[in-house]
Interface confidence: medium
Amino acid sequence: PEPPTACREKQYLINSQCCSLCQPGQKLVSDCTEFTETECLPCGESEFLDTWNRETHCHQHKYCDPNLGLRVQQKGTSETDTICTCEEGWHCTSEACESCVLHRSCSPGFGVKQIATGVSDTICEPCPVGFFSNVSSAFEKCHPWTSCETKDLVVQQAGTNKTDVVCGPQDRLRA
């Protein structure tokens, strides 16, 4: 028969012959021959291969360096890599999450629009008129000014984006 020019899924062409690929979690030891099957071996500890493959070496699991603020989110297996994430209060500096930085705090006059996650930083927004923030925080939103009227009080000092209004008693007309 004619030697194949293409092979089925999960096979590869070598020496004019279709050999089975090694399954995820295993590496290639020797190609198949006319008389023998492809020889595969399981990846060692701390190694993985996540596809049907003909690799002669497994990949090393990622190291989530705790000294860079990283921690293991999910341990690797022979078929999957370790997934790293950042410790609480930190977020990844890149998509690959190779190191972490502390979450940014929103300064007074700014509130948190979106709380940081393990992969994204805090998003701050300026406090609009009628709202204020008097703290530097990675969690606090802008707070609305106190409504003096609902407390039967009047505004004694106007609020800013950093301070609340100051309420005081209404002046009574003396007889």
Partner: antibody, heavy 121, light 106 residues
Amino acid sequence: EVQLVESGGGLVQPGGSLRLSCAASGFTFSSYAMSWVRQAPGKGLEWVSTINQAGGGTYYADSVKGRFTISRDNSKNTLYLQMNSLRAEDTAVYYCAKEGGKYYYYAMDVWGQGTTVTVSS
Amino acid sequence: SYELTQPPSVSVSPGQTASITCSGDKLGDKYAAWYQQKPGQSPVLVIYQDSRRPSGIPERFSGSNSGNTATLTISGTQAMDEADYYCQAWASSTVVFGGGTKLTVL
């Protein structure tokens, strides 16, 4: 041969200060995080502090935070522990340990012989 | 703060299997290491990354870690294995040690 040699221990009065050193040899010192671990007489191991490879990241046990400072000089292959405001409960053998890094993941693969710190009046 | 709990002591006859446990909240999600310490000596790493053995550590030492418990197993225990054993893990950028287990070979 990979080796860690601690020095600087001794007898000090409560409230006093001491600086421990750890001389490293046999490996690329600047490529590894380093730690100090102590052991009080007859007690278990207690982690004290860790410093990352470049020295920019430092971590401390709550019991020493604000009193102890870990540092390193990669040009001298030396790790330090500056201990201030010492208390009787700081009395222990202090070990310097190398983090395993990408070879011995999440562990300390080399330990020094230890140096004894005694805090007493 | 994170805590690791070990039994204070474990006894075993020579040639038998010794198991030392270390428990902590969701410890299986972290990587555990084990150290051996003999009287008057520095600790020695015997297991890292849950189950891996550093070069020079005998095959009779093995480890596992799942759920809330990591286990150090010494099969065919020898008199020379008598020592204190400590488990260790990283938690929130701090290193945590268990209280230690004294292994007595009867």
